[in-house]
């Protein structure tokens, strides 16, 4: 009876999300393997988040708008492990917008989700950021490694969206 009611709850939650995400990919987790964590298909999952690599080329504002339409934000990178996971799925000859910008050009970088910008957990390429006119951050592959670079926000780039996993 308990299992039945849990299944009914799950199905109704799935139906609720169905209107936003036609397909979800879920895995069982938790100490009793009773919880399901889901990401929209074909997003990838890492820890408690889902990621989507957008290959359409858009300015930073439009890229954030595009993520937002999908219930996400441009990616906020909190750890080296997270960055290493994300970069496995990126193309080395492309650049991707991050959810990091310096709106006034005062070198006050801020994340889209208001996570505090921690200088000790940043992965700028050597010599970057290098221009107060370049107020948005991308991740690209340079000198044999992935790192961040400041660029002009209005030049179209690919992007990475991130959202919290859906628990049912």
């Amino acid at each position: 009876n308990f299992m039945y009611s849990k299944t009914v709850k799950r199905l109704s939650k799935l139906q609720e999300y169905q209107q936003y995400y036609p397909s979800l990919t879920c895995v069982m987790e938790g100490k009793d393997m009773e919880d399901w964590s889901c990401c929209p298909t074909p997003w990838t999952s890492f820890q408690s988040s889902c990621y989507f690599i957008s290959t359409v080329m858009q300015s930073w504002t439009k890229s954030q708008n595009n993520c937002s339409v999908m219930g996400a934000d441009l990616v906020v990178i909190n750890t080296k492990e997270e960055q290493d996971f994300i970069t496995q799925n990126l193309k080395i000859n492309s650049a991707y917008f991050l959810g990091l910008s310096d709106p006034k050009g005062w070198r006050h970088w801020q994340w889209v989700d208001q996570t505090p910008y921690n200088k000790n957990v940043t992965f700028w390429h050597s010599g970057e950021p290098n221009s107060p006119d370049e107020r948005c951050a991308i991740i690209n592959f340079r000198s044999e490694e992935w790192g961040w670079n400041d660029v002009h926000c209005h030049v179209p780039q690919k992007s990475i969206c991130k959202m919290k996993k859906i628990y049912i």
Partner: antibody, heavy 120, light 107 residues
Framework: DVQLQESGPGLVKPSQSLSLTCSVT?????????WNWIRQFPGNKLECMGY???????YYSPSLKNRISITRDTSKNQFFLNLNSVTTEDTATYFC?????????????WGQGTLVTVSA | DIQMTQSPASLSASVGETVTITCRAS??????LAWYHQKQGKSPQLLVY???SLVDGVPSRFSGSGSGTQYSLRINSLQPEDFGSYYC?????????FGGGTKLEII
């Protein structure tokens, strides 16, 4: 004010390459923005062909990807269009334009255009 | 690619009249739409960006509206210099495609 001017041969033979230059004055092409080639066919249809960004990256329209190359000479503040294996279908007026104005909401600055005819 | 369908293809009107040109996108372009005016033998001139914002110096008789996939350009009290061709262009995702154009002719 920024000004753009296209130049190049007005007549190209089929199967040859079309090469055009866009000379920019009043703004450095390495400072910001992205620098486009757009063409307008005889029936007036407009097509974005591709661009080169201020930092030297390219985007090419998928329909032209195998034939197009956009390069630049930063010392002369010029960017170039090269289109290979042209046919009579490539007859058009070719414009260069700056992209990224109004937070990338419209092309505010254009050259006056140059007519290229592909004919034997 | 997002396709832009513009209508009508041609339009005849008199000085002083009001005309409306429409543009339909094949997908939601989130108000990232520009309108241009082009005179014979000249390059297109940007009139409107982001669907409804007028470029500095463009007369207030021009106005843009719309959302989602449907947009329009309205010209009140047509002036002789308004005749020529009008084009819409979306700016949502690259490539930024144009509508087929509307030729506005004087009666």
């Amino acid at each position: 004010d920024v000004q753009l001017q296209e130049s190049g041969p007005g007549l190209v033979k089929p199967s040859q390459s079309l090469s055009l230059t866009c000379s920019v004055t009043g703004y450095s092409i390495t400072s910001a923005y992205y620098w486009n080639w757009i063409r307008q066919f005889p029936g007036n249809k407009l097509e974005c062909m591709g661009y080169i960004t201020y930092d030297g990256n390219n985007y090419y329209s998928p329909s032209l990807k195998n034939r197009i190359s956009i390069t630049r000479d930063t010392s002369k503040n010029q960017f170039f269009l090269n289109l290979n294996s042209v046919t009579t279908e490539d007859t058009a007026t070719y414009f260069c334009a700056r992209g990224g104005d109004y937070d990338d909401g419209g092309f505010a600055f254009w050259g006056q255009g140059t007519l290229v005819t592909v004919s034997a | 690619d997002i396709q832009m369908t513009q209508s009508p293809a041609s339009l005849s009107a008199s000085v002083g009249e009001t005309v409306t040109i429409t543009c339909r996108a094949s997908g939601n372009i989130h108000n990232y739409l520009a309108w241009y005016h082009q005179k014979q033998g000249k390059s297109p001139q940007l009139l409107v960006y982001n669907a409804k914002s007028l470029v500095d110096g463009v007369p207030s008789r021009f106005s843009g509206s719309g959302s989602g996939t449907q947009y329009s350009l309205r010209i009140n009290s047509l002036q002789p210099e308004d005749f020529g061709s009008y084009y819409c262009q979306h700016f949502w995702i690259v490539p930024y495609t144009f509508g087929g154009g509307t030729k506005l002719e004087i009666i």
